[in-house]
């Protein structure tokens, strides 16, 4: 039987000669467990593993800790790839994180973090970021230093409230902080003055809910 090639991320897929956008099967580091991920082979040279996408409100992002751990949605559409996979892969080598944003007026912007990784589940998948560049604000809309991940059934934020219940969605909430890309999806003309929407404060401010978001990772040495 022909031996199957194992890919740890979309950068490995790209380097193997598969350079078309689409869904590929990736394998967890040091494991045989597999996950389906969308690979962006065009943006900034390709090789990006998409870990989150919002585009139309078709998927409910008010999910449990376990669902955010293993992932949900459809990799070709709205989805969350899964905190456990992202933790494992970003602890193998240095990764960059690119966050691409769209507003309802046809504008696009991005934030690029030159070093990104998650802590493990025992540390609540705490986010670690360094070196921000990009057009979506000079200040990071993910609070620094990074916070623990919170969901509707796991309150790890710094607010007396439960941010995930107040603002909806799982995120690295502060108290509750300047971003939540997993908030409620609001259609055009209903997207302003929505404090529980898809927020990236240092680009669009407090009450603006975005049209689209993509979070993607790639090895720093790609």
């Amino acid at each position: 039987k022909e031996e199957q090639i194992i890919y740890r991320d979309c950068a490995e897929v790209f380097k193997s000669g598969l350079t078309t956008n689409g869904i590929y099967t990736l394998t967890f580091p040091n494991s045989t467990e597999e996950i389906k991920a969308y690979c962006d082979m065009e943006t900034s040279g390709g090789g990006w593993t998409v870990i989150q996408r919002r585009e139309d409100g078709s998927v409910d992002f008010q999910r449990t800790w376990k669902e955010y751990k293993v992932g949900f949605g459809n990799p070709s559409g709205e989805h969350w790839l899964g905190n456990e996979f992202v933790f494992q892969v970003t602890n193998q080598q240095p990764y960059v994180l690119k966050i691409h944003l769209k507003d309802w007026e046809g504008n696009e912007a991005y934030s690029l973090y030159e070093h990104f990784y998650l802590s493990g589940e025992e540390l609540n998948y705490r986010i670690h970021l360094k070196g921000l560049t990009g057009t979506a604000g000079k200040i990071s809309s993910i609070s620094q230093p990074g916070n623990d991940f919170s969901t509707k059934d796991a309150d790890n934020d710094k607010c007396i409230c439960k941010c995930s219940q107040m603002l909806t969605g799982g995120w690295w909430f502060d108290a509750c902080g300047p971003s939540n890309l997993n908030g409620m999806y609001y259609p055009q003309r209903q997207n302003t003055n929505k404090f529980n929407g898809i927020k990236w404060y240092y680009w669009k401010g407090s009450g603006y809910s975005l049209k689209g978001t993509t979070m993607m990772i790639r090895p720093a040495d790609f």
Partner: antibody, heavy 121, light 107 residues
Framework: QVQLVQSGAEVKKPGASVKVSCKAS????????MVWVRQAPGQGLEWMGY????????GYNQKFEGRVTMTTDTSTSTAYMELRSLRSDDTAVYYC??????????????WGQGTLVTVSS | DIQMTQSPSSVSASVGDRVTITCKAS??????VAWYQQKPGKAPKLLIY???TRDTGVPSRFSGSGSGTDFTLTISSLQPEDFATYYC?????????FGGGTKVEIK
Amino acid sequence: QVQLVQSGAEVKKPGASVKVSCKASGYSFTDYNMVWVRQAPGQGLEWMGYIDPYNGGTGYNQKFEGRVTMTTDTSTSTAYMELRSLRSDDTAVYYCARTRDRYDVWYFDVWGQGTLVTVSS
Amino acid sequence: DIQMTQSPSSVSASVGDRVTITCKASQDVYIAVAWYQQKPGKAPKLLIYWASTRDTGVPSRFSGSGSGTDFTLTISSLQPEDFATYYCHQYSSYPPTFGGGTKVEIK
């Protein structure tokens, strides 16, 4: 200490406009959203809208949309609320208040002393 | 808009009395409720936020409770300076709204 000082009382004719100011001191002006709340004589409190001094972003209560404009001057740490096409039922005390958070419009921890606007022909 | 229905609209009480004011939201507001005290001719003053957290400097005789749609402000032992009007405020949903107020008067 943290305080908000508002401009003095105004008497206006119906159809006119009024611009109320609110000067902040004792904290970093751009770190907190500012809201405007009004109170008609003997009545309750009514939220008019907010402004984020950091980026100028605003959100208005639909009831006042098109008639109200909120602005700030960060060089003087002053917020302004202009209400146009005044009617007699706009007679009220207008308050500015600071929200406890930059990123959300939640509860209001510091209030100005209020500005009485009387609309009368 | 979410309606905040406060009751009673007024209450007569004596110094030392326990006073309870309730506020009912027309839909679930989680714990996103604040309480303010207002004296005649003065601006409102924040007492409680997140339904039960006292603001800095607020005496311990003031307490708040509740979640969802039903909220309570309690003054455990009324003091002379507590005679005022009290307002609840929801900030869970846009636009923020206030209750109609409860006037606490001297009996």
